[in-house]
């Protein structure tokens, strides 16, 4: 999943739509003209801009990978949202690709927590209920459960 | 001659404030943002701000709060006024003519500010 | 903030070489980034805007290339009055993300 996303300072919308820029800077769904007189609207399933922004392009359409779901699309002010198949999460330390949950826990651990698109099952040990992390464990070792399903 | 002059530099105490101004010729300011870089004695060149041609000020994230970009189109300068100045502000500062799409084309000769007690 | 990453910081050439410097941002800026030249004790003077269109004047062993997030300044053949810092300054969101300039390359003469 690639993603270029704006972080400049909120800003109040106008009272009107302008199609010239408000203080310097251009609503969202638009960028600012090479002139920097006139605001150009981004264009639909293309790109986007999601703040007020002096931008000379708007930013370009997140596309999903394989092994991801599309939840919604992008639109002239809001990126495409993609969300791991079921069966498979995304780490936060490595956003980059979907990786497959595991089957179950570790003999001596419990189900604590489904798979998600965005975490793997959580295994805790019996008696201590601390947490376990770590690859998957053997197959023969393993306690099967079937992985939850993607929220809506 | 398209032209940007820049004046009000010297030496100041820590804690003390200074306005710069720059004055332009050749040109009328009110159609342009202008930007004000600053260049530390030997060391590279760093953003300070820029106004836009309806004249909103932005700033480099060190610089809000205590240094304020305005212009005076009527007599076609810009300034910068500079408050609660430290050592660390010692830098030559140079006003600039800023194009959207084709960066800094037109800069000032550079005025030095220097901070000490 | 985008931050603009030079390099490299300071190189010695020969009168006639091929030099090279490369400026790579944080984030995209499409072919918005423009080079700038400084000589000792004067204003810096644009040489390149758009990443590849010259300015007026500058002399035609000056070129510039890339886009999205990496960037070249190519000087075809060094030449004794081309002894200068060169600092790369993307030109797209200014006030967004603010207008950080490159760290610098310092080019000197052999």
């Known amino acids: 999943i690639t993603q270029q996303d704006l972080a400049p300072q909120q800003r109040a919308a106008p009272q009107q739509k302008r199609s010239s820029p408000s203080e310097g800077l251009c609503p969202p769904g638009h960028h600012i003209s090479e002139d920097g007189r006139d605001c150009i609207s981004c264009k639909y399933g293309q790109d986007y801009s999601t703040h007020w922004n002096d931008l000379l392009f708007c930013l370009r359409c997140t596309r999903c990978d394989s092994g991801e779901v599309e939840l919604s699309p992008c639109t002239t002010t809001r990126n495409t949202v993609c969300q791991c198949e079921e069966g498979t999460f995304r780490e936060e330390d490595s956003p980059e690709m979907c990786r497959k949950c595991r089957t179950g826990c570790p003999r001596g651990m419990v189900k604590v927590g489904d798979c998600t698109p965005w975490s793997d099952i959580e295994c805790v040990h019996k008696e201590s209920g601390t947490k376990h992390s770590g690859e998957a464990p053997a197959v023969e070792e393993t306690v099967t459960s079937s992985p939850g399903t993607p929220a809506s | 001659q398209v032209q940007l002059v820049e004046s009000g530099g010297g030496l100041v105490q820590p804690g003390g404030s200074l306005r710069l101004s720059c004055s332009a010729s050749g040109f009328s300011i009110s159609r342009y943002a202008m930007i004000w870089v600053r260049q530390a004695p030997g060391k590279g060149l760093e953003y300070v701000g820029f106004i836009t041609s309806d004249s909103s000020a932005y700033y480099a994230s060190w610089a809000k709060g205590r240094f304020t970009i305005s212009r005076d189109n009527s007599k076609n300068t810009l300034y910068l006024q500079m408050n609660s100045l430290r050592a660390e502000d010692t830098a030559v500062y140079y006003c600039?003519?800023?194009?959207?799409?084709?960066?800094?084309?037109?800069w000032g000769q550079g005025t030095l500010v220097t901070v000490s007690s | 903030d985008i931050q603009m990453t030079q390099s490299p910081s300071s190189l010695s050439a020969s009168v006639g070489d091929r030099v090279t410097i490369t400026c790579r941002a944080s984030q995209s800026i499409s072919t918005y980034l423009s080079w700038y030249q400084q000589k000792p004790g004067k204003a810096p003077k644009r040489l390149i805007y758009k990443a590849s269109t010259l300015a007026s004047g500058v002399p035609s062993r000056f070129s510039g290339s890339g886009s999205g997030t990496d960037f070249t300044l190519t000087i075809s053949s060094l030449q004794p009055e081309d002894a200068a810092t060169y600092y790369c300054?993307?030109?797209?969101?200014?006030?967004?993300?603010?207008?950080?300039f490159g760290g610098g390359t310092k080019v000197e003469i052999k």
């Open positions: 600039a003519r800023y194009t959207y799409s084709d960066g800094t084309d037109l």
């Open positions: 300054q993307p030109n797209s969101g200014i006030a967004t993300y603010g207008a950080a």
